[in-house]
Amino acid sequence: SQPQAVPPYASENQTCRDQEKEYYEPQHRICCSRCPPGTYVSAKCSRIRDTVCATCAENSYNEHWNYLTICQLCRPCDPVMGLEEIAPCTSKRKTQCRCQPGMFCAAWALECTHCELLSDCPPGTEAELKDEVGKGNNHCVPCKAGHFQNTSSPSARCQPHTRCENQGLVEAAPGTAQSDTTCKNPLEPLPPEMSGTMLM
């Protein structure tokens, strides 16, 4: 019959059959079970007994199959660093944080540790849309044709120029990247400086 694959078992080549859920214990030269997420090693394995696991206490966690003798302490999202919570800490997962609105991640070490204010985009531009909010600082791009943006803002979007005719008005001044179209009532006279350009 085939040798059993249930830990603890001898391993002369120092490798275990299930790398995710087992580990090689060098003192005893055996493969032992790791503890599942949400637990830790309360008693280490030996040749007679497999690893004994216990549930992480409140406000602590272990995310992966492990052979840690402690659970990691849950840490709150630090508002001083510009972070806010999106999901609470559980025994199997650390607190999930993200940058507060209007901020981007300025320091990354496996996870975001420090957020900073997004740069303003000047009039005539808008922040390029990113796949993930808060991942990087703003990259300002010009408003596309027929659109404008008239503030210095980290989040303002370019808006389409007003179409005067849709409102029963006529265009008094064309829109630019930084300003909207100016409309007027069709019965209103042209301003004096424009009278020379009227067709008779």
Epitope: Q4, V6, P8, A10, Q27, R47, I48
Partner: antibody, heavy 122, light 111 residues
Amino acid sequence: QVQLVESGGAVVQPGRSLRLSCAASGFTFSSYGMHWVRQAPGKGLEWVAIIWYDGSDEYYADSVKGRFTISRDNSKNTLYLQMNSVRDEDTALYYCVRGDSEDFYYYDFDVWGQGTTVTVSS
Amino acid sequence: QSVLTQPPSVSAAPGQKVTISCSGSSSNIGKNYVSWYQHLPGTAPKLLIYDNNKRPSGIPDRFSGSKSGTSATLGITGLQTGDEADYYCGTWDHSLSASYVFGTGTKVTVL
């Protein structure tokens, strides 16, 4: 030198109790698991029980489970075997044996005492 | 009754070689390391081989061990009269409840 000396062996009536002791010297007793192993007259070796280096866990052979209790006093460097409800088949030479170390490369059953004789007879 | 089976006896002339087999199952030899012990009359048993094939310091290289599947073997070469003793294999067993098991024992006689 490393030494294990058993004592407490005696003639005891079936159903009665007896306590064996094992005095350890020459090594850090509190760092080692310890075993009791026995050999009945004309028979082979039989493992009886193990206790962890810190006394946190114990295991027993099915033949003695519920009747025998292994214990230790690390302050006295002494291992014990409390034998209750003894039977005729418990008649044997009882050896105290050094087990696995808490913090060294695994090396089990490497030091044996000379044994103490238990005779169960009415 | 032991779950590790050994031949009751083996014999050979001085200088010859003997081998002792130890047969178990997947719950003991199949998944654990095997040790071998020498028990000379009137003395305490002595550890000869551990982890299938390793010798403690002081044990001559005339003694060797091996394991394959659910069986283990002890070899003694250059047999000497002082080798006349009972030999036991041993390993941890994880069938129902964990325990250490010894083999039935083999008497080695030097002719």
